[in-house]
């Protein structure tokens, strides 16, 4: 999906009002020195591409993020504010339902959510673009 035509300000508002707080709740109890962010993004569409990938694509050691509250709210925000996004996700959602697993918070998931927080920071304030 090409995130170029999303309403970035509306997505930012959704993130700051609720999603960010859900991410903080998920990370509560984790030391702030524990993880080193290695995933980066250069502009808002790129940030959303990386955010979508980390939030919804199962990875080795962390298969369950898509069912977390912050993920469901992220999906809703993208569906509302990115034209045509929901249509592209129908097949992916059906595939995910087939491999539904019980929620487990692993260290790998915590690391992935730490990466997500970093990506959202850059989405909210791209450093090199004059916005």
């Amino acid at each position: 999906y090409d995130f170029t035509n999303c309403d970035f300000e509306k997505i930012k508002a959704a993130y700051l009002s609720t999603i960010s707080k859900d991410l903080i709740t998920y990370m509560s109890g984790t030391k702030s020195t524990e993880f080193n962010n290695t995933v980066s993004c250069s502009n808002r569409p790129h940030c959303l591409t990386e955010i979508q990938s980390l939030t919804f694509n199962p990875t080795a050691g962390c298969a369950s993020l898509a069912k977390e509250m912050f993920a469901m709210k992220t999906k809703a925000a993208l569906a509302i504010w990115c034209p045509g996004y929901s249509e592209t996700q129908i097949n992916a959602t059906q595939a995910m339902k087939k491999r539904r697993k019980r929620k487990v918070t692993t260290n790998k998931c915590l690391e992935q959510v730490s990466q997500l927080q970093g990506l959202w920071r850059r989405f909210n304030r791209p450093l090199l673009k004059q916005q």
Partner: antibody, heavy 119, light 107 residues
Amino acid sequence: EVQLVQSGAEVKKPGSSVKVSCKASGYTFSNYLIEWVRQAPGQGLEWIGVIDPGNGDTNYNENFKGRATLTADKSTSTAYIELSSLRSEDTAVYYCAREDNTGTAFDYWGQGTTVTVSS
Amino acid sequence: DIVMTQSPDSLAVSLGERATINCKASQSVSSDVTWYQQKPGQSPKLLIYYVSEHYTGVPDRFSGSGSGTDFTLTISSLQAEDVAVYYCQQHHRFPLTFGQGTKLEIK
């Protein structure tokens, strides 16, 4: 606990340079932007620029381009600002600050470093 | 550059009364406004981000509102420890810019 500790006060001659350090602790240094802000005596706050310690990317206020250089040393979790061609108007308290968890504000600030430029 | 203009420059309010500080941007900054408090001899402290979101540990008597070009910081019931200079800041476009500050005193 997140802390930003800055180097001590400096007195400099016009035309010279100054380098101020900002040592971060209590969080992963490379994960958060470091901002630099200054405050002239009795005046308001002026943004100088920002650096991403993770990759060295910077963005400067045009008013300081060419005179201010922001750097970061990941091995010591320390950010630096160097200001060259100093003039009396550069007399100010220089602050480093960290971006907050959302990227939309500065949540932790250093204690400030007073730089006095005088002949 | 976006100019942030605060009003008034200084304000004297009785203890327990409401204090209101305004901030006007020279062009729309969406909701990208932050408020800081600075007490004499101290570094600034974050109060409110993204117009109205409270930073951790900031008392509920502080609130922010507005959008576009006009923003307000309100202290619902002034306490002695609220004496400080208050700054608005926009982070909508580079360079980031601050208001000139509003000095809040007790009447």
